[in-house]
Interface confidence: low
């Protein structure tokens, strides 16, 4: 679609006549009829093909054309076709006298032709004009022609329509050939594309509008390259979403079990070896000197009995140093001067000669030790109680006070807060993990269903014939106080009239 | 002389699918769209969505995007429209027409294709 | 997605009458995507109006749209004996593409 423009610029016709050679009576009022038609090695009659247009008086024999100057005829005249232009054309251009007001072909005398003249030929599409200068005998008439493309019509034969939009259907202007050049943000065939943010992460991050970084399910930051970890993940990461990879020494579905209670707490002090035993639970292993579940408690070097066969310690600056009873000697009292005749078995134990009675050794009885059976045996020195248990001597045998929370012979084993039964009236515990939860039958509320909410038992009316009903709140039951002439739990049988029994 | 010429009227069975093919001439195919767009007997006209012969991009009705697949074949200048999965809600008559991406019009229409879908 | 609805929902009148079609939507829509159809019973729609108030080729004068944003108006000048069928508006300015249900001319 595209418009042939011709703009008229001068005519000449200085003897004012027609093309019978007749004079115009007065002047020559003149006015011009153009037909413009597909291309003919020879122009002849026939229809104006590309479209015909006509002007209204412009001038008097001699005149200058101005533009616009033609009144309901614009001047460039416009010849607007609809189809791919073809690249040629044959013009016909007719100049005429008007004797009166009517322009109309039939309304003219047939002598009323001042010129014609024909031409043809190949045209581009273009803004640039061709001048062109035509004479005949008598006149002479200068213009100028092109064609462009009509609105939305671009190329070589104003054959490609490109409307430029910028809407949901695509976002560009048109190029010269009709090409589509897509506004800035926006890219694809039809522009409908947005450019997102610049790095939003191809398959994570999507946009609805260019510099957006819009992100999918499961993605966070602002080019949707984090991942978001699984709801409630304390102590872990995710490389794809919805993960919980726990982070070392954590553990459980959402990482917040603690199994490097060592490492994130540090409970043993003084040098002491840390050791995890188990969820939250660890053992200190002592340095020497020290003492206690976390190795707390400093020791005097005397308080591991170094000195043997009864003798006393006494503390020193750079150790300790051991007095020994009569008949023993050495750092620790170890060695013996004595012999089975001097009884050295405290405690009710044995001797026993050896090497031909120049020694001996003591067999203790149970609960004691040491060459002399001197020692009460100590069966927590070896801190056996898991989980901060404390270690009790108890005769021949040893036991573990648990903390709470914790049970089996040496505190190994993790309670159930529910074992103990918490929830009162029937309730049904749930172990959480910070404590319990009871769930309450009817009749009971309260954090161990220790609270009676009382049900009105006579709500659903099971007294007949008026009789009064009462609740015992003590057994959330109720009790019908029968009016005269009826018995029976509910009042429901009249006097006289006893329920038939079937035996 | 622009014309849309559909083809003939098909009976399915619920579950199946239904190609309808869309046979386009007296302009040049690729400087348009062709929408199809459906009536159920009795009821008003319903968009499917719509095919640019120029590119192949599609733009479907949310409704059909599952089940629908637009085509055309620029050598034959045809469009076809496939739906699958039919159920006895899909009986209609189905159009195809020429759309303008400038100026938004439909036009001409096809004469329409029915299809009834019955156990 | 844009519903248009149309009213009245049926007319009845006479040869000559002056017709006035209503298409209001449920939010704007430029006027270059409002297009009026005609549908004749057993026939495909026909395009009359589009861009709001361009009239498509081959369609008399009598036919004439206008309208902007929500409200969008069909009207027949003089109604002739073969524009007695059913007037459907329709926009593509939102995706999904709707149309209304339609207002049917009867004879009075």
């Known amino acids: 679609s595209g418009v042939f423009q011709l703009q008229l610029q001068e005519f000449i016709n200085e003897r004012g006549v027609l093309a019978s050679g007749r004079p115009c009576e007065p002047g020559c009022r003149t006015f011009f009829r153009v037909c413009l038609k597909h291309f003919q090695a020879v122009v002849s009659p026939g229809p104006c093909t590309f479209g015909t247009v006509s002007t209204p008086v412009l001038g008097t024999n001699s005149f200058a054309v101005r533009d616009d100057s033609s009144g309901g005829g614009r001047n460039p005249l416009q010849l607007p076709f609809n189809f791919t232009w073809p690249g040629t054309f044959s013009l016909i251009i007719e100049a005429w006298h008007a004797p009166g007001d009517d322009l109309r072909p039939e309304a003219l005398p047939p002598d009323a032709l001042i010129s014609k003249i024909a031409i043809q030929g190949s045209l581009a599409v273009g803004q640039n004009w061709l001048l062109d200068e035509q004479t005949s005998t008598l006149t002479r008439l200068r213009y100028s022609y092109r064609v462009i493309c009509s609105d939305n019509y671009y190329g070589d034969n104003c054959s490609r329509l490109c409307k430029k939009r910028n809407d949901h259907f695509g976002h560009y202007v048109c190029q010269p050939d009709g090409n589509l050049s897509c506004l800035p943000g926006w890219t694809g065939e039809y522009c409908q594309q947005p450019i997102c943010l610049s790095g939003c992460h191809e398959q994570n991050g999507y946009c609805s509008k260019p510099a957006e970084c819009l992100c999918r399910p499961g993605w966070q930051g602002r080019l949707c390259n984090e991942c978001i970890p699984h709801n409630g993940c304390r102590h872990g990461t995710c490389s794809t979403p919805w993960q919980c990879t726990c982070d070392e020494g954590w553990g459980g579905l959402f990482c917040d079990q603690d199994l490097n209670y060592c490492t994130h707490h540090s409970p043993c002090k003084n040098g002491a070896t840390c050791s995890n035993s188990g969820q939250r639970s660890y053992t200190c292993t002592c340095r020497p000197g020290y003492t206690g579940v976390d190795c707390e408690l400093e020791l005097s070097e005397c308080d591991s009995n170094p000195c043997r066969n009864g003798g006393s310690c006494k503390d020193q600056e750079d150790g300790y140093h051991c007095l020994c009873p009569p008949g023993y000697y050495g750092l620790h009292c170890e060695h013996s001067t004595l012999s089975c005749a001097d009884s050295p078995c405290f405690n009710g134990g044995s001797c026993r000669e050896r090497n031909q009675g120049a020694n001996y050794a003591c067999e203790c009885p149970p609960n004691f030790t040491g060459s002399n059976c001197e020692k009460k045996v100590d069966r927590c020195t070896s801190n056996p109680c898991a989980n901060g248990g404390q270690c009790l001597n108890r005769g021949p045998s040893r036991m573990c006070r648990c903390r709470p929370g914790f049970t089996g012979t040496y505190c190994e084993l993790h309670v159930s807060d529910c074992a103990r039964n918490p929830c009162a009236h029937g309730g049904t515990c749930h172990d959480l993990e910070n404590g319990l939860m009871c769930t309450c039958p009817a009749g009971f509320s309260g954090r161990r269903c220790e609270v009676r909410t009382s049900i009105d038992a006579c709500a659903s009316s099971p007294c007949f014939n008026r009789a009064t009903c009462y609740t015992d709140l003590s057994t959330d039951t109720f009790v019908c106080n029968c009016p005269y002439g009826f018995v029976g739990s509910r009042c429901e049988f009249p006097v006289g009239l006893p329920p038939s029994f079937p035996w | 002389q622009v014309h849309l010429v559909q083809s003939g009227a098909e009976v399915k069975k619920p579950g199946a699918s239904v190609k309808v093919s869309c046979r386009a001439s007296g302009y040049t195919f690729t400087n348009y769209g062709i929408t199809w767009v459906r009536q159920a007997p009795g009821q008003g006209l319903e968009w499917m969505g719509w095919?640019?012969?120029?590119?192949?991009?599609?733009d479907y009705a949310q409704k059909f995007q599952a089940r629908i697949t637009m085509t055309t074949d620029t050598s034959t200048t045809t469009a076809y429209m496939e739906l699958r999965s039919l159920t006895s809600d899909d009986t209609a008559v189905y159009y195809c027409?020429?759309?303008?991406?400038?100026?938004?019009?439909?036009?001409?229409w096809g004469q329409g294709t029915l299809v009834t879908v019955s156990s | 997605e844009i519903v248009l609805t149309q009213s009245p929902g049926t007319l009845s009148l006479s040869p000559g009458d002056r017709v006035t079609l209503s298409c209001r939507a449920s939010?704007?829509?430029?006027?270059?995507?409002l297009a009026w159809y005609q549908q004749k019973p057993g026939q495909a729609p026909r395009l009359l109006i589009y861009?709001?108030?361009s009239r498509a080729t081959g369609i008399p004068d009598r036919f004439s749209g206008s309208g902007s944003g929500t409200d969008f108006t069909l009207t027949i000048s003089s109604l002739e004996p073969e524009d007695f069928a059913v007037y459907y508006c329709q926009q593509c300015g939102g995706s999904p593409w709707t149309f209304g249900q339609g207002t049917r001319v009867e004879i009075k």
């Open positions: 939010q704007s829509v430029s006027s270059s995507y």
């Open positions: 095919i640019s012969a120029y590119s192949g991009n599609t």
């Open positions: 027409a020429r759309y303008s991406w400038n100026f938004h019009w439909f036009d001409p």
């Open positions: 861009g709001a108030s």
